[in-house]
């Protein structure tokens, strides 16, 4: 069993701990509690992305963070396996990969993570609110399933109600903070200029003490002002459901693996380069974000455009474990 104290050099973006600023004392006990409670609990991560070029194209990536060896991965959509989910792909480390429409390409990325590209049009195409699930069967841990869907901000072209979003994004807070500072600076400069215009020109006298130049005080949005911000998110249509592909499901035993070429079973030992979408540079806000991570005892997320997402072959690892009882 692993403990969540092992942290790779880089992780996929973790939620910035914006609220932790004034809670330094709260953060350390939480992190310690997290480490204690989560020692030995396997974790599954699911990443869902909609390709910017084709709206009906999705990339699903899943990973298992545990010490066991993976014997089978099942990817489904429409919900978990026991709740009406439809199998899209099955990946076996030795017998290869089997996939069903609209899955286009399923592959092993590392020994403990997989990726699946979906595309489709018509009845079998995925939509923005589809839930994708990955089930990892591993020895000795057993089987573990996790699901994910597109984050609310990723739904393109849908109407946004005036309700607040569940998360005030760290980068948004940073942008607003910087904008606020600039706005404050501009207003202050205008104010100074106006005062300078209306004042009679002072006589030039050698002064012994140079007057202190007034300093514009940089401000960051307070907790109250952050809370007042409304970030719209997209409405979700519930009519979209994956077409039932029951006929395509593997019903028989392992015989269906027989037709697969042996190379399909090869799993890369190192991480596959994930270069389909460049990592956005966070700009000056990165330093603030990193400071917050440091406070919480977490490693900062990626900080620039030229970085590989997962240098550790075991994929991303979230330090933040289960919730502690308060």
């Amino acid at each position: 069993m692993r403990t969540e104290a092992q942290v790779p050099a880089l992780q996929p973006p973790e939620p910035g701990l914006e609220g932790a600023m004034g809670h330094r004392t709260l953060v350390l006990p939480w992190v310690l509690l997290t480490l204690c409670v989560t020692a030995g609990t396997p974790e599954v991560w699911v990443q869902v992305r909609m390709e910017a070029t084709e709206l009906s194209s999705f990339t699903i990536r899943c990973g298992f963070l545990g010490s066991g060896s993976i014997s089978l991965v099942t990817v489904s959509w429409g919900g978990p396996n026991g709740a009406g989910g439809t199998t899209l792909a099955v990946l076996h480390p030795e017998r290869g990969i089997r996939q069903w429409a609209p899955a286009r390409q399923a592959r092993w990325e590392t020994q403990s993570s997989i990726s699946l590209i979906l595309e489709g049009s018509g009845a079998s195409s995925p939509c923005a609110n589809t839930t994708f699930c990955c089930k990892f069967a591993s020895f000795p841990e057993g089987s573990w399933e996790a699901c994910g869907s597109l984050p609310p901000s990723s739904d393109p072209g849908l109407s946004a109600p005036p309700t607040p979003a569940p998360i005030l994004r760290a980068d948004l807070a940073g942008i607003l903070g910087v904008s606020g500072v600039l706005l404050f600076g501009c207003v202050y400069l205008l104010h100074l200029l106006r005062r300078h215009k209306h004042r009679p020109a002072p006589r030039l006298q050698p002064s012994r003490t140079s007057p202190q130049a007034p300093r514009a005080r940089a401000w960051a949005p307070s907790q109250a002002s952050q809370a007042a911000l409304h970030v719209p998110y997209a409405t979700i249509n519930t009519s979209c459901r994956p077409a039932t592909l029951d006929t395509a499901h593997p019903h028989g035993g392992p015989s269906w693996w027989a037709s697969l070429p042996t190379h399909a079973a090869h799993r890369p030992q190192g991480p596959a380069a994930w270069a389909s979408t460049p990592i956005p540079a966070r700009g000056s806000f990165v330093s603030v974000e990193n400071g917050l991570y440091a406070q919480a005892g977490e490693r900062p997320p990626h900080t620039g455009p030229g970085l590989t997402l997962f240098p550790d072959p075991r994929g991303p690892r979230a330090m933040e474990g289960p919730l502690g009882v308060r």
């Epitope: 991560w45 998360i167 502690g324």
Partner: nanobody, 119 residues
Framework: QVQLVESGGGLVQSGGSLRLSCAAS????????MGWFRQAPGKEREFVGR??????????SYADFVKGRFTLYGNQARNTVYLQMNSLKPEDAAVYYC??????????WGKGTLVTVSS
């Protein structure tokens, strides 16, 4: 203030399935972890599983006793999290509590939903 409302509990036969749901309302803006705990009569409250959203990635973690029988999933846009429970055993009978932890470390609990498993 955040309100959590659990639903979906009830009586089920051993080996059966149930889906619990938890809807969060109120000031959930800084929410980033939602999870489930359970408490059987005369026992301490124990962790079942948790889900954490981070951009386009969802992290899910379970207690060891789950062993692939339960699946935790959610809809971030709707502030809802579900616990799909399959192959239920009599020892799974308990009051299941939803928990939400905000970025500032504040914890919120639901009132709980009772799950009874008959053998």
């Amino acid at each position: 203030q955040v309100q959590l409302v659990e639903s979906g509990g009830g009586l089920v036969q051993s080996g059966g399935s149930l889906r619990l749901s938890c809807a969060a309302s109120g000031r959930t803006r800084s929410m980033y972890v939602m999870g489930w705990f359970r408490q059987a009569p005369g026992k301490e409250r124990e962790f079942v599983g948790r889900i954490k959203w981070s951009g386009d990635t969802t992290y899910t973690s379970y207690a060891d006793f789950v062993k692939g029988r339960f699946t935790l999933y959610g809809n971030q846009a709707r502030n809802t999290v579900y616990l799909q429970m399959n192959s239920l055993k009599p020892e799974d009978a308990a009051v299941y509590y939803c928990n939400l932890r905000r970025l500032d470390g504040v914890n919120y609990w639901g009132k709980g939903t009772l799950v009874t498993v008959s053998s």
